[in-house]
Interface confidence: low
């Protein structure tokens, strides 16, 4: 991707991180969320990225031969889901505060929550245009990654934001990758 720029939604961020602009020839992008399992707890976070952060990305899409006429604006979900005492106003901050421990915080990650489908036009060097239908991220959330530490005193389920009811396969596509396809 060319001309990639990212701005931060400051209500959720401590330190900016650029958007993740990787792509392959079919415009498929897998987002790397903020799942953070640290053997050393929080001691590495002197230059910490905290919170499930919504990074606003502006980029031009290219399939190798053609480039989008106008830039695509979307969110990139990044960062770490750290303990609520550290993050009083992060995304998902209302869930199960009293149960949150440093240990359990390591079992959450920042993932795509809401998406929308839109069409973009790519201008080709030979003068022709191509239209792609793509899915862009519009919101992020913290999601539990594992149940391996399900101690009875930790009601992890109560902290999970409700999932939107969608067709199973569409929900998978929307929440697990940014899917780009030829229309």
């Amino acid at each position: 991707f060319k001309n990639d720029a990212t701005e931060i939604l400051y209500s959720h961020v401590v330190k900016p991180v650029p958007a993740h602009p990787s792509s392959n020839s079919t415009l498929n992008q897998a987002r790397n969320g903020g799942r953070h399992f640290s053997n050393t707890g929080l001691d590495r976070n002197t230059r910490v990225q905290v919170g499930c952060r919504e990074l606003r990305s502006t980029k031009y899409i290219s399939d190798g031969q053609c480039t989008s006429i106008s830039p695509l604006k979307e969110l990139v979900c990044a960062g770490e889901c750290l303990p609520l005492p550290v993050l009083p106003n992060w995304i998902g901050g209302g869930y199960g505060t009293k149960y949150w421990s440093r240990r359990s915080s390591q079992e959450w990650r920042c993932v795509n929550d809401k998406t929308r489908t839109q069409r973009i036009q790519l201008q080709c060097q030979d003068g022709s245009t191509r239209t792609y239908k793509i899915t862009v991220v519009t919101a992020c959330k913290c999601k539990r990654y594992t149940r391996q530490h399900n101690e009875s005193s930790h009601n992890f389920e109560s902290m999970s934001p409700a999932k939107p009811v969608q067709h199973h396969r569409e929900r998978k596509r929307a929440s697990k990758s940014s899917k780009h396809s030829m229309s």
Epitope: A30, G33, Q49, E80, K172
Partner: antibody
Framework: QVQLVQSGAEVKKPGSSVKVSCKAS????????ISWVRQAPGQGLEWMGW????????RYNRKFTGRVTITADESTSTAYMELSSLRSEDTAVYYC???????????WGQGTLVTVSS | DIQMTQSPLSLSASVGDRVAITCRAS??????LNWYQQKPGKPPKIVIY???GLPSGVPSRFSGGGSGTDFTLVISTLQPEDFATYYC?????????FGGGTKVEIS
């Protein structure tokens, strides 16, 4: 296009250490998880651990705890895997792999053969 | 740790055949199951993610199904380039674990 390029093959003595590098290009390194997966000759795949490049946060497979150290250098977009106290059963191809959003490996390095022999 | 058990260990098939490989997890992993194809001397390649998601660029003859503990990878019409070893992998909890692999050979 995302690419992971690993360092070359190594021959090591039992008891020594090996450090394999994995240079990433074509993406934002700081917001990615790099895992290390090994494969002994004729055997299956074994996950060793991962690093979240933005913070250096790591998670290791208990089997390797104390012997494996995964690090990352943001300035060069390179991840490293160091395995110590090598034994013959550590002879394997070591892969670095970059995870997608929910724990599947979207991109892989070409692999580095580490041979442990006296 | 979650154990992943694949079956069969190997299978012989012909071009055009329908092939199914199963993977069983030692505990429920929801839909956090991925399938990889590996050819000799090459790194694995993702063919199905999240139990049934088809990555861009992977032919539609590959499909995945299942949830909880039992999963299936199906190749509807086997092609010459599909002869390889296939691995399942759970991404539900660390340590991430793989099945032992299923080698699809030419009969």
């Amino acid at each position: 296009q995302v690419q992971l390029v690993q360092s070359g093959a190594e021959v090591k003595k039992p008891g020594s250490s090996v450090k394999v590098s994995c240079k990433a290009s074509g993406g934002t390194f700081s917001s990615t998880y790099i895992s290390w997966v090994r494969q002994a000759p004729g055997q299956g795949l074994e996950w060793m651990g991962w690093i979240y490049a933005g913070t250096g946060g790591t998670r290791y497979n208990r089997k390797f705890t104390g012997r494996v150290t995964i690090t990352a250098d943001e300035s060069t977009s390179t991840a490293y895997m160091e395995l110590s106290s090598l034994r013959s059963e550590d002879t394997a191809v070591y892969y670095c792999a970059r995870e997608g959003v929910d724990g599947w490996f979207t991109y892989w390095g070409q692999g580095t053969l580490v041979t442990v022999s006296s | 740790d979650i154990q992943m058990t694949q079956s069969p260990l190997s299978l012989s098939a012909s071009v055009g055949d329908r092939v199914a490989i199963t993977c069983r997890a030692s505990q429920s992993i929801s839909d956090s199951l991925n399938w990889y194809q590996q050819k000799p001397g090459k790194p694995p390649k993702i063919v199905i993610y999240a139990a049934s998601g088809l990555p861009s660029g992977v032919p539609s003859r590959f499909s995945g199904g299942g949830s909880g503990t039992d999963f299936t990878l199906v190749i509807s019409t086997l092609q010459p380039e599909d002869f390889a070893t296939y691995y399942c992998q759970q991404s539900y909890s660390a340590p991430l674990t793989f099945g032992g692999g299923t080698k699809v050979e030419i009969s």
